[in-house]
């Protein structure tokens, strides 16, 4: 019993399908009953490899793993003709991981694996700062999203004013985090930030406003 | 479905501009950039810039930086090129296109600007 | 500015054959990469991005793959109707730029 399908890595965007091939072939001497098995072995290692369906005596079981529940399917009607390949439907975050296809027809026995990552736009930036917006004061403006595959890239842009960024943010424009050291009123502006990955771009907006700094006389 | 509406052709004379238009439709304007290429006859794409409704931050090619001007108006869910100075080389046909990230999902039908005397 | 260069320029097959057209960066790309159809008097149209991902639509028998600063796109089973010009460009850092195209026609 041999899977003809090589190891590969699989590349798809969240709330598509995932095809995994697992084709095999089986040698005359292979007669005992066909036993098809896929787990998933999550990228979060929280878990050991898992059952997410199984093929034995004729019946399908896909009921195993209840965060792919109702999103994995052989795609063949006819199993025993030699192919195993599944589909995983609206992908999630959750499906990245290692997929193993064992297949079982005694005395032969084979598996396969394949890598599933699901690459995720990003959304949900928020830009904020994080200290006093004072002058003369140091603090950190930052940019968030809530969700997106790495690597991110990054992108402060000045919108108001002259639009240019201070010279001392320059090293810092393609970072999440800006550290703004000694504020001067001249900072204040509208900047915005986008964050990008190869799949898409999200952008979000902060409004500075440095100020002189409150009278703290008690 | 998406929709990027554009004005079909534009005649004008050496040294004068023309302010070409891109009406969206069918997705939320202010959450996507949207990309101008230039297209000469028979020739390959240029990427001249993109601007990002929401905000109106820009991002140009160098190259077309004293040529070309970015601009939008979210009431009508319209972006606006304007190209300054024509010359014979301004004569392409220029698109608009919407970015999912910085590759063009959805593209207009393109506008033919023929620099002429 | 990072230069896309993209071979063959032009490539004749017949119906049912499959084809592959390459991309060539001249810098890393880290899969920053996109695939265009481009038929006769029409607008270009997304095939596909991020290297490898198929846009909504697009026939299964289009596939992109490649890592670094080499790419491919292969038409599978090749159709009448996929006689246009094809560009690949990146976005990995301004300004985005576009290979110069391949011209695919049918025997």
């Known amino acids: 019993l041999s899977i003809t399908t090589p190891e590969e890595m699989i590349e798809k965007a969240k709330g598509e399908t995932a095809y995994l091939p697992c084709k095999f072939t089986l040698s005359p001497e292979d007669q005992g009953p066909l036993d098809i098995e896929w787990l998933i072995s999550p990228a979060d290692n929280q878990k050991v490899d898992q059952v997410i369906i199984l093929y034995s005596g004729d019946k399908i079981y896909d009921d195993y793993y209840p965060d792919l529940k109702g999103r994995v399917h052989f795609t063949s009607n006819d199993l025993k003709s030699g192919d195993a390949s599944i589909n995983v439907t609206n992908l999630q975050l959750s499906d990245i991981g290692t997929y193993q296809c064992k297949v079982k027809k005694a005395p032969g026995v084979a598996n396969k694996k394949i890598h599933l990552v699901v690459l995720v736009k990003p959304s949900g930036a928020r830009c904020y700062v994080d200290g006093s917006e004072e002058i003369g004061s140091d603090f950190k403006i930052k940019c968030e999203p809530k969700e997106g595959s790495l690597p991110l890239q990054y992108e402060w842009q000045k919108l108001s004013d002259s639009q240019k960024m201070p010279t001392s943010w320059l090293a810092e424009m393609t970072s999440s985090v800006i550290s703004v050291k000694n504020a001067s009123s001249e900072y204040s502006g509208t900047y915005s930030c986008t964050v990008r990955n190869r799949v898409g771009s999200d952008q979000c907006l902060l409004r500075l406003n440095v100020v002189p700094p409150s009278n703290k006389a008690g | 479905q998406v929709q990027l509406q554009q004005p079909g052709a534009e005649l004008v004379k050496p040294g004068a501009s023309v302010k070409l238009s891109c009406k969206a439709s069918g997705y939320t304007f202010t959450s996507y950039w949207i990309n101008w290429v230039k297209q000469r006859p028979g020739q390959g794409l240029e990427w001249i810039g993109n601007i990002y409704p929401g905000s109106s931050s820009t991002k140009y090619n160098e190259k077309f930086k004293s040529k070309a001007t970015l601009t939008v108006d979210t009431s009508s869910s319209t972006a606006h090129m304007q190209l300054s100075s024509l010359t014979s080389d301004d004569s392409a046909v220029y698109y608009c296109?919407?970015?999912?990230?910085?590759?063009?999902?959805?593209w207009g039908q393109g506008t033919l600007v023929t620099v002429s005397a | 500015d990072i230069q896309m260069t993209q071979s063959p320029a032009s490539l004749s097959a017949s119906v049912g054959e499959t084809v592959t057209i390459t991309c060539r960066a001249s810098e890393n790309i880290d899969s920053y990469l996109a695939w265009y159809q481009q038929k006769q008097g029409k607008s270009p149209q997304l095939l596909v991005y991020a290297a490898t991902l198929l846009a909504d639509g697009v026939p299964s028998r289009f596939s992109g793959s490649g890592s670094g600063t080499q790419y491919s796109l292969k038409i599978n089973s090749l159709q009448s109707e996929d006689v246009a010009r094809y560009y690949c460009q990146h976005y990995y850092s301004t300004p985005w730029t576009f290979g110069g195209g391949t011209k695919l026609e049918i025997k």
């Open positions: 296109a919407k970015g999912d990230g910085d590759y063009f999902a959805d």
